[in-house]
Structures are given as C-alpha cells and as structure tokens.
C-alpha cells in the first residue's frame, strides 16, 4: 500500500465572520488505522480544535460521516466564525495506541476572517478654539479584518489632506483597529460644519461606514460688542444700547456697570439662531441723567462661554441743559428732574442720592 | 482509553427475550460502529449484526435479521442487542465490540455477557 | 456471503519456531487496493484481540513477531518465533462484505 498522505487542498480560505467555514482534508490510505484530529497552530502550543475519536466541539462538525465505510474524507466544518477564529488549521492523522501517536500533518490551511470595522466614531478636542486655530478630530473604528483599510476625511464634503493615520497593531492579528486625527483650521463660519471620517474596507461591499462630528462642539466664536444711546425726552432719560452680536455657544452673561459698579446682570438665552448659527443678543439700560451731577461712565461686560470679560464702555456727559441725543458715543446730558425710574424689573434702580 | 462495559449474566428460558447492553467510553460513542459477536461454548466466533450510533443504521447478518434488534441510547453512550424467540443453541457469551477504522473490524471488544438458554 | 475457511484446525509448534496459519476465503476480498482481512487471538477466558488488519498491518501494541500477508484470496498470519504467552486460537475476519469470521485455528506448544 501507498504511504500515507494527509491533504489540505486549501492554502487558505477567508470567510466573513457569522458564516461558517469548511476546511477540507482527505488522507490517500486507510492505513494505519486511527483517528484524525485537528489543530489551530504547530509546534507545542497547538489548540485542539477536533478530536474524531473523543471530547465535544460544539462549533465543529465533520462534514462527512466519520462512520461511512472506508472514509478517508476528514474536512470540517465550523460554525459562526469569529475573528478569534483565524489562524492556520493542520489536519493530523494519529496511529491508534495509547496514547495515539501522530503519523502525518497536513500542509495546514490558513483561516482568514473577514471582519467588519465597527462604526467609526469621531472625537472633537476637549476644549473650544477660535477662528484661525487648529483643532484635532480622532476617528477610530475597531475589530476588523483582514488588515487593508481606508480612511478619509471630509469638513462640509470636500476632502481634507492634513491628517495622520495609524492602523494597529502593526504585526499579524486576528483583528485590527484604526486611529486617525485630522487637523481642522476653524473660520467663524464653522458653527453649521461638520467633519466626516469615512472608512473603507471589503467587508463593506462599498458601502463605507461613516462617522461625524459637528464642529458647533468645537468651535467658540467670540461677540463683537458695540454700545449705542439714543434719548428719550420724557423724564430725562438715555437709552443705552449694548450690541453683542455673531457669537457661539450661547453661554454668555452680560453685566452694566455704572461708573463700576454692577448695576444689572443677565445671562442670555433661547436667542434666535442666526443663519450662520451664531446668536446676535441686545441689551438695554435705562439712565436716568437728572440723578447725576457728573458725567456717568457705563460699561458693557461680556464673559461668553466662560472666557475673560470683554468691556465696552461708553460716557453718558451730563451738562447744563438737556439736549436731544442721538446715536452718538459720548453725550451730553441735563436734567434736573430726580424722580426715580422703575423698569419691569425691581432689580434695576438707576436713582442715585 | 476506549472501554466497552457489559451487562451481567442472564439464564433465560427457550422462546424468552433478553436484551444485553454495553457501555461505551474514552471515546465519541457516535464516531464508530459497535459490532455485536457471540461465540458458543467451545465454538468459533459469529457476527450478529452492527449498528452506527450516530443514525442507527444496521447491518444484519441473514440469519439473526428476524431476531436481533440493535439500538442505541446516544445520552448514555450505550448499545443494546435484543435476541427474541431464544433457544438452547442461543447459549454463548455475546460480545460487543467498537470499529475503530470503519473497516467493518472489531478494534475493541467488551468482555462477554453469557446468555445461558435453558428450560 | 463470502466463507473464510482456515487451515490447519490446530498446530502445535515448539517454541522459538515459525508459525503459520492460512485462510483462504470463497471471493476475493480485495477492494479499491486493500484486502480486508483481520486476524484476532483470542485466549481462554478473554474477548478476542485484534492482531491485524487490511491483510499486513500490524495493530497498535502488537509485537512485531507476528505478521500478515496475502492478497486476493488466500492469506497468511506468520509467529516468527513463538512465544508461550501465543499460545490461542486464532481468527480471520473478512470485511470486503459484511463481516465473517473463519472457524478458528487452536496453536499450542509442541
């Protein structure tokens, strides 16, 4: 009779995970008489997968009956393949004794699994930046296989270049993840951007995965501040106007100061978005002139999204006679009418003995 | 290591049943074929029948088909050899034994269950 | 069905010497390059064990004193140098179709 010969057709098989996986082998002899087992690996540490002969392998079952006369057809089949699952499988044919004794291996056949990545899911930096500064966005994705896969960035559909990728580990493994960090120059018309990292493998079919970041998380835009006064003729009073406008994120509090001291505070909220979407909010202070004898320094002060105060301040001049004013950024003022002047709110008193 | 365990000693009387069972480990019991054997005082060896207990398909030896029923309990990893209608010429010690190869062989045998047929 | 017919019924040999039992059977028993022909012992008191298999195959903790040839027909089990614990009857077993058995051969000490 001819010498034994174990043989795996197969140099390799990839199967994608969740399917199942046949690894074929036959044996050209009936001799010697003894049971097939297979193994993930060579050498010492090999890991038993199938035993024909003895112990329970749930996943794996030989795909013909091992009790078919002169059988000589040992493939296997695995079911719902994990990329845990990959690595080289060697068919090994024993001699029956005790214990068996190994007689021949096949050439082995390598078991690839074909893993998708997960979702790719993007960070934005920590803290917010400005205009004209760089922020860096990280996309990863994980458990995928084989190796190959391609990343891409894109802000608003065009596709970016300044970004680094990594894909680890660098080395054979049953599954893999991707790192990528693209640096993004922020404008003040970044609040409605966005960033998409895109990622494409053969699992995919075509189909990549994507995954996005709003810039609104990443971007401060600081308030443009511009005081105005207009009078009102009744009851000697001005007008002040503080414009704060194009700013994001909504967080911002506003506080008048009169000659220094606090006078009136607000935190501003449910503003109207711009189109951009920034928020434009306006406030007001009513001053009553005829309550000072000199002129009254008013300050706006803004502290938006937790950053230093930003102050505008503007003088209100009070002089001999009243006068009509406009929009002017220092009046003058007269009046000797000191009655006091209640807004809605209690809080605001402008009466100064 | 691959041992078959069979049932105790029966006395029957002629024209009774008795079923002998075999206990198989140290191996996967629905991998091989168990063979069942007898043997007369003093005389040779006759093939009975076998059984595969992965699906039980059986294969007979002509003149025990009418007789012989081979089951088997795969829970238990047990075989079982049923003979009907005995007679005195059923006196002998009933072997099973496991076919390693599926060669149709008789790799590994129990140690006998005497039936002993008498009135 | 295929008949296996052994010779001699029994043999006495001294020890140390050849022994040689045949069995011949009714058809060929070869099949796809094998001949499927076992050889058991089997000793007083004991289940038979099996020697060889597909004809020339030495069984797994044999000793290496007995072996088997033939194809075809007719076979041969060969002690090349007999033992006292050999002394058995000694069985054929065709399995080319379902199994039989030959009648035996008793080996004894000369």
């Known amino acids: 009779e001819e010498e034994l010969q174990v043989i795996q057709p197969e140099k390799s098989v990839s199967v994608a995970a969740g399917d199942s996986a046949t690894l074929n082998c036959t044996v050209t002899s009936l001799i010697p008489v003894g049971p097939i087992q297979w193994f993930r690996g060579a050498g010492p540490g090999r890991e038993l997968i199938y035993h024909q002969k003895e112990g329970h392998f749930p996943r794996v079952t030989s795909v013909s009956e091992s009790t078919k006369r002169n059988n000589m057809d040992f493939s296997i089949h695995i079911s719902n393949i994990t990329p845990a699952d990959a690595g080289t499988y060697y068919c090994v044919k024993f001699r029956k004794g005790s214990p068996d004794v190994e007689v021949k291996s096949g050439a082995g056949t390598e078991l690839s699994v074909r893993a998708k990545p997960s979702a790719p899911v993007v960070s934005g930096p920590a803290v917010r930046a400005t205009a004209e500064h760089t922020v860096s966005f990280t996309c990863e994705s994980h458990g995928f296989s084989p190796r190959d896969i391609t990343l891409k960035w894109f802000k608003n559909g065009n596709e970016l270049s300044d970004f680094q990728t990594n894909v680890d580990p660098a080395g054979k493994s049953v599954s893999y993840s991707i790192r990528s960090t693209a640096r993004v120059v922020l404008t003040r018309r970044d609040v409605h951007s966005q960033v998409i990292c895109e990622v494409a493998h053969v699992t995919l079919q075509g189909d990549p995965l994507r995954g996005t970041a709003n810039l609104s998380e990443a971007i401060r835009v600081p308030p443009f501040l511009e005081v105005t006064q207009q009078s009102m003729r009744a009851d000697n009073q001005v007008n002040v106007t503080c414009q704060v406008t194009k700013f994001y994120p909504q967080r911002l509090q506003l506080t008048w100061l009169e000659n220094g001291n606090v006078s009136r505070t607000e935190m501003a909220s449910a503003l109207p978005e711009n189109k951009d979407g920034t928020y434009n909010w306006t406030s007001w202070l009513l001053v009553n002139v005829s309550a000072h004898r000199d002129d009254v320094k008013l300050t706006c002060q803004v502290e938006h999204d937790g950053q230093p105060a930003v102050n505008k301040s503007f003088s209100v001049k009070v002089s001999a006679h009243p006068k009509e004013q406009g929009s002017n950024t220092a009046a003058e003022n007269t009046g000797t009418n000191e009655r006091d002047y209640k807004d809605d709110d209690d809080k605001h008193h402008h009466h100064h003995h | 290591q691959v041992q078959l365990v069979q049932s105790g000693a029966e006395v029957k009387k002629p024209g009774a049943s008795v079923k002998v069972s075999c206990k198989a480990s140290g191996y996967t019991f629905t991998n091989y074929w168990i063979n069942w054997v007898r043997q007369a005082p003093g005389q040779g060896l006759e093939w009975i029948a076998m059984i595969d207990p992965s699906d039980s398909e059986t294969h007979y030896n002509q003149i025990f088909k009418d007789r012989a029923t081979l089951t088997t309990d795969t829970s238990t990893s047990t075989a079982y050899m049923e003979l009907r209608s005995l007679r005195s010429d059923d006196t002998a010690v009933y072997y099973c034994?496991?076919?390693?190869?599926?060669?149709?062989?008789?790799?590994?045998w129990g140690r006998g269950t005497l039936v002993t047929v008498s009135s | 069905d295929i008949v296996l017919t052994q010779s001699p019924d029994s043999l006495a040999v001294s020890l140390g010497e050849r022994a040689t039992i045949n069995c011949r059977a009714s058809k060929s028993v070869s099949s796809s390059g094998y001949n499927y022909i076992f050889w058991y012992q089997q000793k007083p008191g004991q289940p038979p064990k099996l020697l060889i298999y597909?004809?020339?195959n030495l069984d797994s903790g044999v000793p290496d004193r007995f072996s088997g040839s033939g194809s075809g027909t007719d076979f041969t089990l060969t002690i090349s140098s007999l033992q006292a614990e050999d002394v058995a009857v000694y069985y054929c077993q065709e399995s080319r179709e379902l199994p039989t058995f030959g009648q035996g051969t008793k080996l004894e000490i000369k």
């Open positions: 034994a496991m076919d390693y190869g599926s060669l149709y062989a008789m790799d590994y």
């Open positions: 597909l004809a020339s």
